[in-house]
């Protein structure tokens, strides 16, 4: 092909090529043609004769102002036609007359201000029609009933001011899953406008200035329709009362989006008319007081998003939002509750009472004063089958005994990014009989005891990154009870002392993070009593991160038991010489990171076993000694291997001898080494 299109599997991509005409040298069997972002002004039908197999044609982002009706005659199998971001202004009855097999027609961002006659009457198979971002002033798309298979009609970002039944009755035989009317200036819903449509399942009116009064009228017009999904995000709905959604009483609404409304007052029984509602989006509002009956009637809601819904008006404590006790008691089917990023004063004793199906609760950054978790804090969740609880970013400083004793079903507890500073007696976790993961990373300090985790033997994941961990060297180990542990993160704790039995009995451990500590002394032969083999027995370990520990020595047998190790990260240490056979048992090793060490020599007797099945190697920024003795084997291996070695050309440079300083390692000439080298290459 003379054009620079890329063709693969009957798909031709000719985008972004500044084309002024349709290429004539593409394979004739292509089914998809992408001509977006070019300089096409017209689409001569004749140019498509050879591409009669096309099912999808995308000519978006060009300057096409007219369409030849014959185009679709040449493309009898065309199903998807995308004309977005062009300069079409007129559509005649002939424009798409031959496009009878179309299922998708995209006309967004053109200059179509009015639809005359019936340009879409032949599109009996059309499923999606996108006319958003045009200048349409009405929803009138024709004068007779048509588009009986249409499911999505997208009319957002136009200039529509009223919905009229006589304009929408062309859809009398259609079942619209999505009528998208967002970002219009709708001021009127004429009587029967939605009843003109055969069946309407989804209505999207985001960014339409409805306000409480027009919202109420809208809902009355939706009465006795098939509406399931209603989205009214950013519609200036500042208050709701027990009449706002009254019209929806005669519907089976399952999804309601009221996000970004600056909603301030949610009156009692506002949603009493929505017993079928399952998904309720209320995020980014400004609710000052949630009354005990504000959510009354929402018996079927399964998902409720209240993220950033309760925010304080000013710095004054008196302006903090209020949630009455028992406010959630009506939500008997609620499974997922998101209350992130709020300014709620605290958890009251009956805040969550009645949520008998709640499984997921996010309270991240939700409270202004949740400094201490007591044995009363979560009492209102005692009858909830909670599986996941997120308490991050709440400035929690202390967890008292029995704080979670009400949460016997809890599997994941996230307490990260708080200010917890205390001795962990183990009583904090009492009652967590099904706990799977505790995330405690990024807290102030944690002092461990032999019983810190005695009551949670089911624990499989424990994250203790950057918590200024104390007493980790006690014996028996604080981790001794955790025989089901598969992931342990002890990184960024500046740990300098640990015993050889710290990880004893953790035979199921698969991931161990010990990066950014101070463990160098433990592996020194000069260490009193010899090196400490704290990795012994971890026969199922898959990932080991020991980055940034200051290691300058590795004992020869330190990885001996780690038969299943797949990833070792020893980067950013001070390793120079590694003992031969140190990696002999690492038959499963896939990734080895030794970047930014002091390695000068890469010899077969040390690295041969480790490199055998490697898929990724990182030895960047080491001061390689470019001599035959030091790197000849390595260079030969590099040039033969299929292992991925990122930045090989730029960051694997010789340091010595002086005349090779800065020279790329992979270009080191090993041919002169063969005769004189007293070792096997």
């Amino acid at each position: 092909s003379t054009t620079k299109c890329t063709v693969s599997h009957e798909v031709a991509d000719c985008s972004h090529l500044k084309l002024t005409q349709v290429p004539d040298d593409l394979p004739t069997n292509i089914t998809v043609l992408n001509l977006t972002h070019n300089q096409l002004r017209r689409l001569p039908a004749a140019n498509f004769t050879r591409y009669s197999q096309l099912t999808s044609l995308d000519v978006g982002f060009n300057t096409i102002s007219k369409l030849e009706p014959e185009l679709c005659q040449k493309l009898p199998m065309l199903k998807v036609l995308n004309l977005q971001h062009n300069e079409l202004s007129q559509l005649s009855d002939k424009t798409f007359a031959f496009c009878t097999n179309l299922t998708e027609l995209h006309l967004m961002s053109n200059s179509i201000q009015k639809i005359k006659n019936n340009p879409f009457v032949k599109q009996k198979n059309l499923i999606t029609l996108d006319l958003s971002h045009n200048g349409l002033s009405s929803t009138k798309l024709g004068t007779q009933v048509q588009l009986e298979n249409l499911q999505e009609l997208l009319l957002s970002n136009n200039k529509i001011q009223a919905l009229k039944s006589e304009e929408l009755d062309i859809f009398a035989n259609s079942s619209l899953k999505k009528l998208e009317l967002s970002s219009n200036q709708i001021k009127e819903f004429s009587p029967g406008c939605f009843h003109a449509i055969g069946r309407l399942f989804g209505l999207f009116l985001n960014n339409v200035q409805l306000g409480p009064s027009l919202t109420e009228k809208l809902c009355l017009e939706l009465a006795n329709t098939s509406i399931r999904n209603l989205s009214l995000s950013n519609s200036q709905l500042s208050t709701t009362s027990n009449t706002t959604f009254l019209g929806l009483k005669w519907t089976n609404l399952t999804m309601l989006d009221l996000s970004y409304n600056n909603l301030n007052v949610v009156g009692n029984d506002s949603f009493a008319w929505l017993p079928q509602l399952e998904y309720f989006f209320l995020e980014y509002n400004n609710i000052q007081h949630l009354f005990s009956h504000s959510l009354h009637g929402l018996f079927n809601v399964r998902y409720l998003n209240l993220k950033r819904s309760f925010t304080k008006q000013s710095i004054s404590l008196a302006s903090l939002p209020k949630i009455d006790d028992f406010s959630f008691q009506w939500l008997k089917c609620l499974e997922h509750l998101n209350m992130e990023d709020n300014d709620i004063p605290g958890i009251k004793s009956n805040m969550f009472t009645g949520l008998i199906n709640l499984k997921y609760l996010s309270l991240s950054n939700s409270f202004t004063s949740l400094r201490t978790l007591t044995n009363e804090t979560f009492v209102s969740l005692a009858h909830s089958p909670l599986h996941i609880l997120n308490l991050t970013k709440n400035k929690i400083s202390k967890i008292e005994s029995d704080a979670f004793s009400w949460l016997g079903h809890l599997e994941v507890l996230d307490l990260g990014l708080n200010e917890i500073g205390q001795e962990l007696t183990g009583q904090e976790w009492r009652g967590l009989e099904n706990i799977f993961e505790i995330y405690l990373s990024y807290n102030k300090y944690l002092q461990l005891t032999r019983n810190s985790f005695a009551l949670v033997p089911s624990l499989q994941r424990l994250m203790l990154r950057r918590v200024a961990l104390k007493n980790v060297d006690s014996s028996p180990s604080p981790f001794q009870p955790l025989r089901n542990l598969t992931i342990l993160d002890l990184s960024n704790n500046n740990i300098a002392n640990i015993n050889d039995d710290m990880l004893e009995g953790l035979e199921k451990l698969e991931i161990l993070d010990l990066q950014h500590n101070n463990l160098a002394r433990l592996w020194k032969h000069a260490n009193p009593g010899g090196p400490i083999y704290f990795l012994k027995g971890l026969s199922h370990l898959h990932i080991l991160n020991l980055e940034s520990n200051g290691f300058d020595e590795i004992p020869v047998e330190v990885f001996k038991d780690l038969f299943e190790l797949k990833i070792i990260d020893l980067g950013l240490n001070n390793l120079n010489t590694l003992p031969a056979s140190v990696f002999n048992n690492q038959v499963s090793l896939k990734s080895l990171n030794l970047q930014k060490n002091l390695i000068t020599s890469v010899e077969k007797k040390v690295f041969g076993p480790a490199f055998r099945n490697l898929t990724e190697l990182d030895m960047r920024f080491n001061p390689f000694d470019c001599t035959c003795e030091s790197i000849a084997w390595f260079v030969n291996w590099i040039n033969e291997t299929h292992t991925n070695i990122p930045e090989l050309s730029s960051h694997y440079l010789c340091n010595t001898p002086p005349h090779y300083h800065g020279f790329p390692v992979r270009l080191f000439d090993t041919s002169s080494c063969k005769d004189s080298a007293p070792f096997e290459l």
């Epitope: 009492r430 032999r450 009551l455 033997p457 001794q480 009870p481 004893e504 009995g505 035979e507």
Partner: antibody, heavy 119, light 107 residues
Framework: QVQLVQSGAEVKKPGASVKVSCKAS????????IHWVRQATGQGLEWMGE????????NYNEKFKTRVTMTRNTSISTAYMELSSLRSEDTAVYYC????????????WGQGTLVTVSS | DIQMTQSPSSLSASVGDRVTITCRAS??????LAWYQQKPGKVPKLLIY???TLADGVPSRFSGSGSGTDFTLTISSLQPEDVATYYC?????????FGGGTKVEIK
């Protein structure tokens, strides 16, 4: 199933030493600490100390620290408790015990070894 | 060291009676307390751990309560086979001391 089998009864003279053994079976010997508890005749129970069979690390009850030695032989899954400078008040049944999945309890006990100190 | 004080040292009750034994720790042991039953010439048998959790195979007439320093073992309806000495033991920090024992007899 977990079993702890102890050596037989011993009679010792004051000033002598006694070494009681505890053979473990039904689990991996090196993964659970072994504790020693004694019970003087007609008296209560007294915790003496614990040993890690994996590395031999020991935590003793200060009361016995100068006289007791705890050791193990991993090849035969056996723990030992040796008490020296025996006195008549050391006459007692000596038990080895092991914690369960919940490490704050002794569900597993040896059958006990009676040590009699008598001149 | 934490001392464990058990009371009473002995008691006599009728079959079917509710029996209560208390154990007091000299310091906070949280809920790390176990109760054992020992019959004459036998090995101690675990009844309750973590202050209130019933060990496997133990009849439901046995129950435990308490936290911190004060703990209770209750036999809701005394049976002839419950004649034994009962010991409490803490597991907070070494040494793991035992209470002096409570001998339970049938009237």
């Amino acid at each position: 199933q977990v079993q702890l089998v102890q050596s037989g009864a011993e009679v010792k003279k004051p000033g002598a030493s006694v070494k009681v053994s505890c053979k473990a079976s039904g689990y991996t010997f090196t993964t659970y600490w072994i504790h020693w508890v004694r019970q003087a005749t007609g008296q209560g129970l007294e915790w003496m100390g614990e040993i890690n069979p994996n590395n031999g690390r020991i935590n003793y009850n200060e009361k016995f620290k100068t006289r007791v030695t705890m050791t193990r032989n991993t090849s035969i899954s056996t723990a030992y408790m040796e008490l020296s400078s025996l006195r008549s008040e050391d006459t007692a049944v000596y038990y080895c015990a092991r914690v369960g999945v919940m490490i704050t309890t002794f569900p597993y006990w040896g059958q006990g070894t009676l040590v009699t100190v008598s001149s | 060291d934490i001392q464990m004080t058990q009371s009473p040292s002995s008691l006599s009750a009728s079959v079917g009676d509710r029996v209560t034994i208390t154990c007091r720790a000299s310091g906070n042991i949280h809920n790390y307390l176990a109760w054992y039953q020992q019959k004459p010439g036998k090995v101690p048998k675990l009844l309750i751990y973590n202050a209130k959790t019933l060990a496997d195979g133990v009849p439901s007439r046995f129950s435990g309560s308490g936290s911190g320093t004060d703990f209770t073992l209750t036999i809701s309806s005394l049976q002839p086979e419950d004649v034994a000495t009962y010991y409490c033991q803490h597991f907070w920090s070494t040494p793991f001391t035992f209470g002096g024992g409570t001998k339970v007899e049938i009237k």
